[in-house]
């Protein structure tokens, strides 16, 4: 497969990643398919540095991000393991809150206004970003 | 400029298959995501399937999930659409469109069509 | 899914009409939306994207509004090749969807 040396336009290189930013919003599992259809993911932060290069993108803004907790466990988007990743929750959260009262309770995660992260409803419609690693092979699957 | 070529399409039974392929020029095809629209004679539009630039993602319409199948080969700039177990209602002027620049979600070009009739 | 509701499904109108077609969507999309003009025999061609902005080599004469679920296309000065099918597209949410069209028709 081919290999991915540098950005799409309108992304942004970092780390050895490439970012795109969205200016709209949609409800979670859109957005994740967004991502998916430009061969990437919602944005997986396993740094400190890479949370801080996101926020100041994003700037105060709601914004999704690749973890949901939607099949039990709290689970990133590439399989980067949560448990011994990086974690930047807002105190006291997640708390898969049912008192918004539109049925059921959190299971994904967006940055906050001020970057730290909250779990909310998955149908409300947050901007995102997208993320795709440099050199990353292709997948793409044979012809028949 | 930009241009997409449909072929393939033709008459074909109730549960035959045929395999529409999408040539294209003029822009880099791997830096885009592609799609398959449909249109029925005299009728409206309808999505059938959209595959990613590097082909790792797919999604389909309900209306041909488990029977048609999307697929690229980025070294030949070409889209294909296989499709298995045709009904009468799969007959439509298919049209190859390609996702504006940029993003995807609509579409910025589109070929001329190919005409599939499913009859006996 | 989401549904479109384009309406009207036809209108008659005279070169240099301004007029205007609606469009409606069953969700909020906010502005995930597109507007494509048909002719016969040939295939849309896209015309507004992201409700409002104008794709490139589209003349200025049309133009396109709104957000949330409701949504128009405009076309300030109609030109005689201006007589076609418009048809509006959401993008918000897999499957994509399409209006089912209003035809421009000459009176």
């Known amino acids: 497969g081919s290999e991915r040396t540098c950005c799409p336009v309108n992304w942004v290189e970092h780390e050895r990643s490439c970012y795109w930013f969205s200016r709209s919003g949609k409800a979670w599992a859109d957005a994740d398919n967004y991502c998916r259809l430009e061969d990437a993911h919602l944005v997986v932060v396993t740094s400190w540095e890479e949370q801080k290069f996101v926020q100041h993108h994003i700037g105060p803004v709601n914004t999704w991000m690749g973890l949901h907790d939607q099949n039990g466990p709290w689970k990133w988007v590439d399989g980067t393991d949560y448990e011994t990743g990086f974690k930047n929750w807002r105190p006291e959260q997640p708390d898969d809150w049912y008192g918004h009262g539109l049925g059921g309770g959190e299971d994904c995660a967006h940055f906050t206004d001020d970057g730290r992260w909250n779990d909310d409803v998955c149908q409300r419609p947050y901007r995102w970003v997208c993320e795709t690693e440099l050199d990353k092979a292709s997948q793409e699957p044979p012809l028949l | 400029e930009v241009q997409l070529l449909e072929s393939g399409g033709g008459l074909v039974q109730p549960g035959g298959s045929l395999r529409l392929s999408c040539a294209a020029s003029g822009f880099t095809f791997s830096s885009y995501a592609m799609s398959w629209v449909r249109q029925t004679p005299g009728q409206g539009l309808e999505w059938v399937s959209a595959i990613s630039g590097r082909g790792g993602t797919t999604f389909y319409a309900d209306s041909v999930k488990g029977r048609f199948t999307i697929s690229r080969d980025n070294s030949k700039n070409t889209l294909y659409l296989q499709m298995n177990s045709l009904r009468a209602e799969d007959t439509a002027v298919y049209y190859c469109a390609k996702d504006g620049y940029g993003g995807n979600s609509f579409f910025d070009y589109w070929g001329q069509g190919t005409l599939v009739t499913v009859s006996s | 899914d989401i549904q479109m509701t384009q309406s009207p499904s036809s209108v008659s109108a005279s070169v240099g009409d301004r007029v205007t077609f609606t469009c409606r969507a069953s969700q909020d999309i906010f502005d995930w939306l597109a507007w494509y003009q048909q002719k016969p025999g040939t295939a849309p061609k896209l015309l507004i994207y992201a409700a409002s902005s104008l794709q490139s080599g589209v003349p200025s004469r049309f133009s396109g509004s709104g957000s949330g679920t409701n949504f128009t296309l405009t076309v300030s000065g109609l030109q005689p090749e201006d007589f076609a099918t418009y048809y509006c597209?959401?993008?918000?949410?897999?499957?994509?969807?399409f209006g089912q069209g209003t035809k421009v028709e000459i009176k």
């Open positions: 597209q959401q993008a918000y949410s897999f499957p994509w969807t």
